[in-house]
């Protein structure tokens, strides 16, 4: 990396600087560079059984630099580390290892997962969803009039998408059946969604449960709770003639 690898061809004493190549300030035949010109980093490069001094403009991969008053020196990071702040703290691991708190690991500790993009161990992120929005008006084929039985829906937003090992998001849509007073559509009202139409809150006996949006809504079988709701609806039919009733059903 930006190496100016000054070596000598002519035999000379280690403390003599004439004839050194590149960035070397002093050099020897056997050891290469012994010291470097200002601002260059001194690094020891292993060649076979021998260590050769080289002078570089910055420390190579797997080394970190220390600027001492008299020498800028490259020191080797730990074996599994590609970039480090010092001996104790790695900042980028070699291929196949994951960085966690300055250390390089084969696998991430429990409760953490590997980010294969950054090659770091990161916290597992679970899905987070908002509160449900209010139920939509009771509609059938997009209309709020001209029918007795319809459906209403509600939605919630995903606030935080999960990471690979995180909990999956729960459904973000729910639909339930509802009933309204049968009413003919006024002229120009056909197809209009009537948010102004009030829905009565279900009574204690009425189920408020709902299920995630599903195609099986129409084909589902009636359960006892629903029968009870229907009986209550019949009883109230007369007194509630002018009001619309919202009934939620479980499927």
């Amino acid at each position: 990396q930006n190496a100016s690898r000054g070596r000598r061809q002519r035999r000379m004493h280690p403390n003599v600087s004439q004839g050194c190549q590149g960035g070397c300030a002093t050099c020897s035949d056997y050891n290469g560079c012994l010291s470097c010109k200002p601002r260059l980093f001194f690094a020891l490069e292993r060649i076979g059984m021998k260590q050769i001094g080289v002078c570089l403009s910055s420390c190579p991969s797997g080394y970190y630099g220390t600027r001492y008053p008299d020498i800028n020196k490259c020191t080797k990071c730990k074996a599994d580390c590609d970039t480090c702040f010092n001996k104790n703290f790695c900042t980028k691991c070699k291929s196949g290892f994951y960085l966690h708190l300055g250390k390089c690991l084969d696998n991430c500790p429990e409760g953490l997962e590997a980010n294969n993009h950054t090659m770091e161990c990161v916290s597992i992120v679970h899905c987070e969803v908002s509160e449900w929005n209010p139920w939509s008006p009771c509609t059938k084929k997009g209309k709020t009039c001209g029918f007795k039985r319809g459906t209403e829906t509600r939605v919630r937003e995903i606030i935080q998408h999960p990471s690979a090992k995180g909990n999956l998001c729960p459904p973000t849509n729910e639909t339930r059946k509802c009933t309204v007073q049968r009413k003919k559509c006024q002229k120009g009202e056909r197809g209009k969604k009537g948010r102004e139409r009030k829905r009565k809150k279900p009574n204690k006996g009425e189920s408020k449960e709902a299920i995630p949006d599903s195609k099986s809504l129409e084909s589902s079988k009636e359960i006892p709770e629903q029968r009870e709701n229907k009986q209550q609806q019949k009883k109230r039919k007369v007194q509630d003639k002018q009001k619309s009733v919202s009934v939620s059903t479980v499927h």
Epitope: Y64, T66, R67, Y68, P69, D70, F85, N86, K87, N88, F89, T91
Partner: antibody
Amino acid sequence: EVQLVESGGGVVQPGRSLRLSCAASGFTFSDYDMAWVRQAPGKGLEWVATIIYDGSRAYFGDSVRGRFTVSRDNSKNTLYLQMNSLRAEDTAVYYCTAHDRSFDYWGQGTMVTVSS
Amino acid sequence: DIQMTQSPSSLSASVGDRVTITCLVSEDISNDFVWYQQKPGKSPKLLIYAASRLQDGVPSRFSGSGSGTDFTLTISSLQPEDFATYYCQQSYKYPPTFGQGTKLEIK
């Protein structure tokens, strides 16, 4: 567990000498540059001196250069600070620390009071 | 020598507060920068190295940012054990120099 234990602090008269020691354990002492950092009462941190891993070179802060010397014995995992010609302004807690760009490990400190 | 200007020198805050301490450096030091925490009567403890990386055991409410000459230590939600003195240090070159310290006190 990394441990650095300083000793040798005490009360000394101006102009006199004192020698601090630091016993290291729990890490490879001979791999690390070692330093002394001091803290005067109610004041901040001041770097005093660093000796490189093999003991071949040492560096000093301006305020102590020429008066203090630092040495180490890697066979005993021990760091020393020889303080000569002590002055009132040398009064401080002296910490022994492993110095590798940052000061990664610290001892509990030893108090040096220079007073007549 | 590289000069470090740390601010504020003292700061009063309450548990749960978000706190920011800054350090200005007299020359570009890339990210060769460290933060320490020191509690009364104790030795300093390394919190953050390489400007933004948390030392093992340091809670995630601590974070460091910056590069070049401007650095910041942030505590997102102060806890009772965070009341201490904080020091910055440049690790770019000798001599190593520290900021003057920021004493974080309970309001």
